[in-house]
């Protein structure tokens, strides 16, 4: 018993002593945060000069405060001991960690391509202001029906068949029925109208095609090879749409 | 049946943290948005952030960004809250909200409403 | 103040119908889904109308919703007692990538 307490007692001498040895050591480790240890000075914990700042102790140096220039805008100051934070004007959004890049907003129903802001092609939609449009729902792989149409500012809803159901009560996640549902005359029209867009598609690249062969490959390559760029330009196009398909993927008051 | 149970209110001061946890039972947690929405008492409802299961995006009301921070541990099927630097104007009950339309079939949840609901806890900000 | 804009009060009589109207703008009710809330004295809110008009299984068929443009409105027919209580419309809002609740309307069943 007596040499259990005799060790207890002996590690935390030890380890007393090397804290105050640490310390008489390093005296840099004694500078709390928003202070550096200046060498040049006998190793006193200086402040940090105006726009720098320490967000630890015993650090031998400030860093440099963020500054938010620009489309960035300050959400909170640089003090001494943490760096200042930036957010995006008006009509942009923060991407990144930090927010260490501005991107454009667009309006519900657009997606930002490298020619700014384009209308959501038909059968996608986004209903934020960043972002991609994405296909519609597709309520029959879950076996539900159609209830609402989307937009290119929303997606379609999805509820029971309607013989599941009363009329207007639906239930919000219904249980999949287990046969498909029938091919309606919305969805043959539906894939006859893609049919003859992808003929149409084929008709354009095998013009697009010739034409490439007479001039010459340079053209076609850099439309390919030419970056994704996010612009910074505050002017919306409008004209068309993005076909692109991606992959799946305050108030006071009293009452 | 959907099961929402909300924890770690209490009593906290100005400047001070908190971090609030939701456990669910009864669905699938990780197909789903989940909301926090808080209410001060003799007040209304105000939406306070939302968190997607797919790809994780999380979006915040204007008095909250910067101090709150939602996050999932889809797991332990838990919804939590870290809340720093708490005003007075925090004090309120926070509940945990699931939101309807299950992903990643459906793509967007915001026509479905929140259609799950904790019975909320109590955070009280004084000094 | 609220983004969107509901009376702070309503009442009728049993048996009659109500309607509690919620204002918006392009930006949450003209673009987006309108949701309906019902919170009893004491209670979390329960979802009472999704997609503007359609009612959840449970939701009495005396509840129905409505939009037109950037407001909502719901209506609630052959009033009963236990229908007095606070309800809150609800919609995303794109420009502030958030959702956003009205003020709430306290119904009373006189």
């Known amino acids: 018993m007596g040499n259990s307490c005799y060790n207890i007692v002996a590690t935390l001498l030890l380890v007393l002593n090397f804290e105050r040895t640490r310390s008489l050591q390093d005296p840099c480790s004694n500078c709390p945060a928003g202070t550096f240890c200046d060498n040049n000075r006998n190793q006193i914990c200086s402040p940090c000069p105006p726009n720098s700042f320490s967000s630890a102790g015993g650090q031998r140096t400030c860093d440099i405060c963020r500054q938010c220039k620009g489309v960035f805008r300050t959400r909170k100051e640089c003090s001494s001991t943490s760096n200042a934070e930036c957010d995006c004007t008006p009509g942009f959004h923060c991407l990144g960690a930090g927010c260490s890049m501005c991107e454009q907003d667009c309006k519900q129903g657009q997606e930002l391509t490298k020619k700014g802001c384009k209308d959501c092609c038909f059968g996608t939609f986004n209903d934020q202001k960043r972002g991609i449009c994405r296909p519609w729902t597709n309520c029959s792989l879950d076996g539900k029906s159609v209830l609402v149409n989307g937009t290119k500012e929303r997606d379609v809803v999805c509820g029971p068949s309607p013989a599941d159901l009363s009329p207007g009560a639906s239930s919000v996640t219904p249980p999949a029925p287990a046969r498909e549902p029938g091919h309606s005359p919305q969805i043959i029209s539906f894939f006859l109208a893609l049919t003859s867009t992808a003929l149409l598609f084929l008709l354009f690249f095998l013009t697009l095609r010739f034409s490439v062969v007479k001039r010459g490959r340079k053209k076609l390559l850099y439309i390919f090879k030419q970056p994704f760029m996010r612009p910074v330009q505050t002017t919306q196009e409008e004209d068309g749409c993005s076909c692109r398909f991606p992959e799946e993927e305050e108030g006071g008051c009293e009452l | 049946e959907v099961q929402l149970l909300e924890s770690g209110g209490g009593l906290v001061q100005p400047g001070g943290s908190l971090r609030l946890s939701c456990a669910a039972s009864g669905f699938t947690f990780s197909g789903y948005d989940m909301s926090w929405v808080r209410q001060a008492p003799g007040k209304c409802l105000e939406w306070v952030s939302v968190?997607?299961?797919?790809?994780?995006?999380?979006y915040y009301a204007d008095s909250v960004k910067g101090r709150f921070t939602i996050s999932r541990d889809n797991s332990k099927n838990t919804l939590y809250l870290q809340m720093n630097s708490l005003r007075a104007e925090d004090a309120a009950v926070y509940y945990c909200a699931k939101h309807g339309g299950q992903k990643p079939t459906t793509k967007s949840s915001s026509a479905y409403g929140m259609d799950g609901w904790g019975q909320g806890t109590l955070v009280t900000v004084s000094s | 103040q609220s983004v969107l804009t509901q009376p702070p009060s309503a009442s009728g009589t049993p048996g009659r119908r109500v309607t509690i109207s919620c204002s918006g703008s392009s930006s949450n009710i003209g673009n987006n889904y309108v949701t309906w809330y019902q919170q009893l004295p004491g209670t979390a809110p329960k979802l009472l109308i999704y997609?503007?008009?359609h009612r959840p299984s449970g939701v009495p068929d005396r509840f129905s919703g409505s939009k037109s443009g950037t407001s909502a409105s719901l209506a609630i027919s052959g009033l009963r007692s236990e229908d007095e209580a606070d309800y809150y419309c609800?919609?995303?809002?794109?420009?502030?990538?958030?959702?956003?609740f009205g003020g709430g309307t306290k119904l009373t069943v006189l």
């Open positions: 997609a503007d008009s």
């Open positions: 609800a919609t995303w809002d794109y420009s502030l990538s958030g959702y956003v």
């Open positions: 968190i997607y299961p797919d790809d994780g995006n999380t």
